[in-house]
Interface confidence: low
């Protein structure tokens, strides 16, 4: 129903704590360079205003839309043009154009320093002094680096962070309690970020229909006992929630997500037998739990899919009379039978089925034409299955770091024009798929691998869009989202690339590398590896292995030497010479 004051309505629904957290996330995602203090001040002003509207919905400006209220706040920030350049031009526009303008200026790769975690003692001190400010800093720092992070889920991660600190700061050895737990939350949050960015890309580039198809497939896999009407309702609601979050309407998004969780818990009987554990939890944990709940047991008596979609003589009539509904039921029926497939694969199969009906239903004998459609799915299914087997075998042989290096070589050869930092980031993320997915049971590997790779490649596309340099990447990123991963997999060495000339300074290292954390050391070595491939794109795996082994040996020797600086300055040039010779 319509409310006299939208801001009062959301404040009442969400409660002060969540309201403030979401407003802080919204401001941090829009204006990514502002300090925490600047945003905290705005949040307090907005919250105070919301309270006046709760007290009197007819008070001045309480009837204004949230976009108008928030936009006016952002546009009142001093020195907006000096700090944000052309983003300040958005403030000359009226709603809804102004909000659209803000959205277009969100930066997926802001030039902010990495989010460094303070050491345990310092963290615990500031957490104990002021938990609210501490968590506010966390929300602000994550949100500004990830401008499309799913806001209600970020509140969940902040809650996790809070619980870990409460527990570990009471321990004697704070460091060893905090580190593994916070690393776990960080890893999950980063995966959540790329997954949500993929959803927003789907919504932005291909509209609600594309996202809804994704949701139907995903929900049908998870809830195979729910009927199509139920799945359609859930998919519609989930699409609305994601549309709101991707559009910056974070209060509405969080409110509607809570409503959806409530609906699911009140209708478990018609949705799934696996929801009770989630439904017993408090709000943020409940919604998070529902989003990754295990698949329900598939009904035992499901008839063959062919009965309705191939053998039925009325297929073309059913298709013609209600295309979206008919294709929707196909996607539902196929997905509920295949929890072992990735959503991307299911959408490719639905697309193939649609194309087949478009072609066959215009022919003289449609059943003869579409009769083989299920057999034609086979190559589409085999391709990702082979990808999983090949890559998981390689991961098991090389381990995560070695697997990342193999991917780095592969992708640098496919798109050598892409900047080295982007290639290294992509390869490291793609390489984590091994640890994340290859250890899972066989039937869970394919959905895990392909849907994760698709999300990472979406980030590659977003970064490449800012500065397009590779025709290969442009080609793969221009197609539909579900075809991206197969497109990237099919790329071979870019024959148009003119190799980079060898620069000794690229491969010159100093003793400061010895004190870097292991992760930073790996990044330095992987940066060198990418540069080697850019210099010799057709170097064999054997040649590259020789050089990298030599390089690792050099680092090990010099970092153990009594006089590290001398070792690096004398042995370094020898290493460079040996590298050139090995690749000649």
């Amino acid at each position: 129903e319509a409310h006299k004051s939208e801001i009062a309505h959301r404040y009442n629904d969400l409660g002060e704590q969540h309201f403030k957290g979401l407003v802080l996330i919204a401001f941090s995602q829009y204006l990514q360079k502002c300090s925490y203090d600047e945003h905290a001040k705005l949040v307090q002003e907005v919250t105070d205003f919301a309270k006046t509207c709760v007290a009197d919905e007819s008070a001045a400006n309480c009837d204004k839309s949230l976009h108008t209220l928030f936009g006016d706040k952002l546009c009142a920030i001093p020195n907006l043009r000096e700090n944000y350049g052309e983003l300040a031009d958005c403030c000359t526009k009226q709603e809804p154009e102004r909000n659209e303008c803000f959205l277009q200026h969100k930066d997926d790769n802001p030039s902010l320093p990495p989010f460094e975690r303070p050491e345990a003692e310092a963290m615990c001190t500031s957490f104990k002094e002021n938990p609210t400010t501490f968590m506010g800093h966390y929300l602000h720092e994550v949100a500004r680096r990830h401008p499309y992070f799913y806001a209600p889920e970020l509140l969940y991660y902040a809650e996790q962070y809070n619980e870990i600190l409460t527990q570990c700061c009471a321990e004697a050895d704070k460091e060893s309690c905090l580190t593994p737990k916070l690393d776990g939350v960080k890893e999950k949050a980063l995966v959540s970020s790329v997954r949500q960015r993929m959803k927003c890309s789907s919504m932005q580039k291909f509209g609600e229909r594309a996202f809804k198809a994704w949701a139907v497939a995903r929900l049908s896999q998870t809830f195979p006992n729910a009927d199509f009407a139920e799945i359609t309702k859930l998919a519609t609601d989930l699409t609305k929630v994601n549309k709101e979050c991707c559009h910056g309407d974070l209060l509405e998004c969080a409110d509607d997500r809570a409503e959806l969780a409530k609906y699911m818990c009140e209708n478990q009987a018609t949705i799934s037998s696996k929801l009770q554990t989630c439904c017993d939890k408090p709000l943020l944990k409940k919604a998070h739990c529902l989003s990754e709940v295990e698949h329900d047991t598939m009904p035992a008596d499901l008839p063959a899919i062919a009965a309705d979609f191939v053998e039925d003589q009325e297929v073309c009539k059913n298709y013609a009379e209600a295309k979206d509904v008919f294709l929707g039921t196909f996607l539902y029926e196929y997905s509920r039978r295949h929890p072992d497939y990735s959503v991307s694969l299911l959408l490719r199969l639905a697309k193939k089925y649609e194309a087949t009906l478009e072609k066959c239903c215009a022919e003289a004998n449609p059943p003869a034409c579409y009769g083989t459609v299920l057999a034609e799915f086979q190559p589409l299914v085999e391709e990702p299955k082979n990808l999983v087997k090949t890559n998981c075998d390689l991961y098991e042989k090389l381990g995560e770091y070695g697997f990342q290096n193999a991917i780095l070589v592969r992708y640098t050869q496919k798109a050598p024009q892409v900047s080295t930092p982007t290639l290294v980031e992509a390869a490291r993320n793609l390489g984590r798929v091994g640890t994340k997915c290859c250890t899972l049971p066989e039937d869970q590997r394919l959905p895990c691998v392909e849907d994760y790779l698709s999300a990472i490649l979406n980030r590659v596309c977003l970064l490449h869009e800012k500065t397009p340099v590779s025709e290969h990447v442009t080609k793969c990123c221009s197609g539909s989202l579900v075809e991206r991963r197969p497109c990237f997999s099919a790329l071979t060495v870019d024959e148009t690339y003119v190799p980079k000339e060898f620069k000794a300074e690229t491969f010159t290292f100093h003793s400061d590398i010895c004190t870097l954390p292991e992760k930073e050391k790996q990044i330095k070595k992987q940066t060198a590896l990418a540069e080697l491939v850019k210099h010799k794109p057709k170097a064999t795996a054997e040649q590259l292995k020789t050089v990298m082994d030599d390089f690792a040996q050099f680092l090990d020797t010099c970092c153990k030497a009594a006089d590290k600086d001398t070792c690096f300055s004398t042995e370094g040039p020898n290493l460079v010479t040996r590298c050139k010779d090995a690749l000649a």
Partner: nanobody
């Protein structure tokens, strides 16, 4: 389990009208794809009209399009078939059928419906 019970059949003159009802129990009628079929003496059972579950999209056999209207009343858990401009060739036993938990679209293939009513006879004659 879904139980279906048809009513409303009878004798009617050509050009006349009849309204058939099908009361469902055991499952909500809006959650399942439902359809009307008919069987004339000595002939195969044929699809007449259907309506999707959760999606109010209707389907009709070419022979009844424009004359028959399928609808449902969710509050009464009942399916209807409004038959106008009746012809002698519409004479048959009319059956109501349901297919829950399958695609929520109607199929025109009788074998795909697990639940059936006992039928109601419609005779069109002068």
């Amino acid at each position: 389990e879904v139980q279906l019970l048809e009513s409303g059949g009878g004798l009617v003159q050509p050009g006349g009208s009849l309204r058939l009802s099908c009361a469902a129990s055991g499952r909500y009628i809006d959650e399942t794809a439902v359809a009307w079929f008919r069987q004339a003496p000595g002939k195969e059972r044929e699809f007449v009209a259907g309506i999707g579950g959760g999606v109010d999209i209707t389907y009709y056999a070419d022979s009844v399009k424009g004359r028959f209207t399928i609808s449902r009343d969710n509050s009464k858990n009942t399916l209807y078939l409004q038959m106008n401009s009746l012809r002698p060739e519409d004479t048959a036993v009319y059956y109501c059928a349901a297919r829950p938990g399958r695609p929520q679209i109607t199929s025109k293939v009788a074998d795909l419906y697990p639940y059936w009513g006992q039928g109601t006879l419609v005779t069109v004659s002068s």
